[in-house]
Interface confidence: low
């Protein structure tokens, strides 16, 4: 996939920033707001931030600029720079009236068919598990194979460096074709097939990618919020995987929830399958020692481990992946829509 150019975005924060720089009032306000960061810590939802008057004034100035509605894209060039601008501007939106975080990512959904050649899979035993088959599909694709080998190398060995491993994982889930990435991670296993389940759980190399000692979940979130990319991915996940009703209907679409979920892999908030016998997922963190924030901690943890929208989105994608191999397709090469709306 070619990376989206700025011009393909409705209102890229990079473009808006350049426009702002050409206007002395806007430029001064942006710089001032940027310097306000240290004096305004990101408050907990229960706290009111105390904001210096000059920062409020700068925020007010920016509210009239094109920066205020700017967005970024998950696969754009200079994504981190774009997100940096987004979160600086976000303060202008939220100062004075604490606003819940809004995903910085614009949804540019492409519906390009994904060509898969299943005939090459005949080198596998017919009864091979689907996780093995999806791994083979990745191997048969040059780009997927190259990206997978890169993170496999970075994440293996007794002395793997976690930060390097995470960076390569992030790159894989960002640059590999979405159906390949989803097939690899969300491959279905028979309930009693522990080998398949173990293969799936090990897809993201948890021994290296996940912290050796589970940190407190709120500490993990604090760490995540200090990084524009991680913060963006977490907010995107909370936006698109929010259950809207008791049936677990997602706030937007299941496909967007899954994209947001995969976007977290390689960040500080990397989730994974909990065991090799089911499809439950969780963050690698604990709520022990949360004191009077126990409830807030459990809510964060529950957004991963007890989220009916996410559970149903994963289950639907796995059903879809099962069908790919269970049906008699007319030709060994067939096209599958890359972005299914499975709601």
């Amino acid at each position: 996939d070619p990376l989206p150019t700025e011009s393909r975005l409705m209102n890229s924060c990079l473009q808006a920033r350049r426009k702002c720089q050409a206007d002395p009032t806007c430029s001064a306000a942006y710089h001032h707001l940027d310097s306000c960061t240290s004096s305004i810590s990101t408050p907990l939802p229960s706290e009111e931030p105390s904001v210096p008057a000059d920062c409020l004034e700068a925020a007010q100035q920016l509210r009239n600029s094109s920066l205020i509605g700017c967005m970024c894209h998950r696969r754009m060039k200079n994504q981190v720079a774009c997100l940096d601008i987004y979160w600086t501007v976000h303060r202008a939106r939220s100062l004075g009236n604490y606003e819940l975080d809004v995903s910085p990512y614009e949804d540019t959904v492409t519906s390009k068919p994904w060509k898969m050649n299943l005939s090459k899979l005949n080198m596998l035993k017919p009864d091979s598990d689907l996780c093995l088959k999806f791994a083979m599909l990745c191997t048969l694709n040059d780009k997927c194979d190259r990206l997978r080998k890169a993170y496999g190398e970075a994440c293996s060995g007794p002395h793997c460096q976690r930060h390097v491993c995470l960076r390569q994982l992030l790159t894989f889930f960002e640059k590999a074709a979405e159906p390949h990435a989803q097939g690899l991670l969300l491959c279905p296993c028979a309930p009693n097939d522990r080998g398949c389940g173990e293969r799936r759980r090990n897809t993201i190399a948890p021994n290296c990618a996940l912290p050796p000692v589970a940190p407190n979940c709120l500490e993990l979130r604090r760490l995540c919020f200090s990084d524009p990319l991680c913060r963006s991915r977490l907010v995107d996940f909370q936006t698109h995987c929010h259950p809207m009703d008791i049936l677990g209907t997602c706030a937007t679409e299941q496909s967007r929830c899954l994209r947001a979920y995969l976007g977290l892999i390689g960040t500080a908030m990397t989730p994974n399958f909990v065991s090799n016998v089911n499809t439950s997922v969780a963050l690698s963190c604990t709520c022990r020692g949360s004191g009077n924030l126990q409830e807030e901690c459990e809510m964060l943890e529950g957004f991963f481990s007890h989220n009916p929208c996410l559970t149903e989105a994963i289950a639907a994608k796995m059903r879809f992946h099962s069908q790919l191999f269970s049906q008699d397709w007319p030709h060994p090469t067939f096209a599958v829509m890359a972005h299914q709306n499975e709601n």
């Epitope: 008791i246 409830e295 459990e298 943890e301």
Partner: antibody, heavy 123, light 107 residues
Framework: EVQLLESGGNLVQPGGSLRLSCAAS????????MTWVRQAPGKGLEWVST????????YYADSVKGRFTISRDNSRDTVFLQMNSLRAEDTAVYYC????????????????WGQGTLVTVSS | DIQMTQSPSSLSAFVGDRVTITCRAS??????LDWFQQKPGKAPKSLIY???NLQSGVPSRFGGSGSGTDFTLTINSLQPEDFVTYYC?????????FGGGTKVEIK
Amino acid sequence: EVQLLESGGNLVQPGGSLRLSCAASGFTFSSYAMTWVRQAPGKGLEWVSTISGSGTSTYYADSVKGRFTISRDNSRDTVFLQMNSLRAEDTAVYYCSKPSALRFLHWLCMDVWGQGTLVTVSS
Amino acid sequence: DIQMTQSPSSLSAFVGDRVTITCRASQDIRNYLDWFQQKPGKAPKSLIYAASNLQSGVPSRFGGSGSGTDFTLTINSLQPEDFVTYYCQQYNSYPPTFGGGTKVEIK
């Protein structure tokens, strides 16, 4: 400590109305869906109604639809059940409940319960 | 609506016995099932959530298992305070439904 305290139960004639309240404390009330469940004397448990944390979504059992209305006041941490056109078969202890923090997304979970309030419909 | 069939409706046992109560759903409810204990004149109390997870503060003699349509509540070594009524409840599908209850009586 999380607490739910129901009130408003009483003896009422068929066709009459009653308003039950459930006062909550010890948790962030607006983050949680709240549910009413009832139990007729000597019988099992029956789900009555659920309201989302914001109050924008409400759900009712077929047996009470059109007669009962669930609502909440997040500024007072209270959930209400307005019962109209009461029938003898509505006689029951009415409990309010909520999911635990771990399962706040599962609106239909009932991890914490109040002590209940008795509604008797009889002439 | 999903029907929850609980069996037996009542059982008699001795203190120290191991008892099993089953709950069958009319269709697949994954692991979205809870078990409650209710003492006479009291509100129900949550024992097991998501089929097999023990609520905090609940004695370890209680255990839950199952997924799909068949679920089991097991009480190992019955204590005098366990001779009460037990209910299952599904929350996989709207509306939520309860089993009819199982009354555990002392022999």
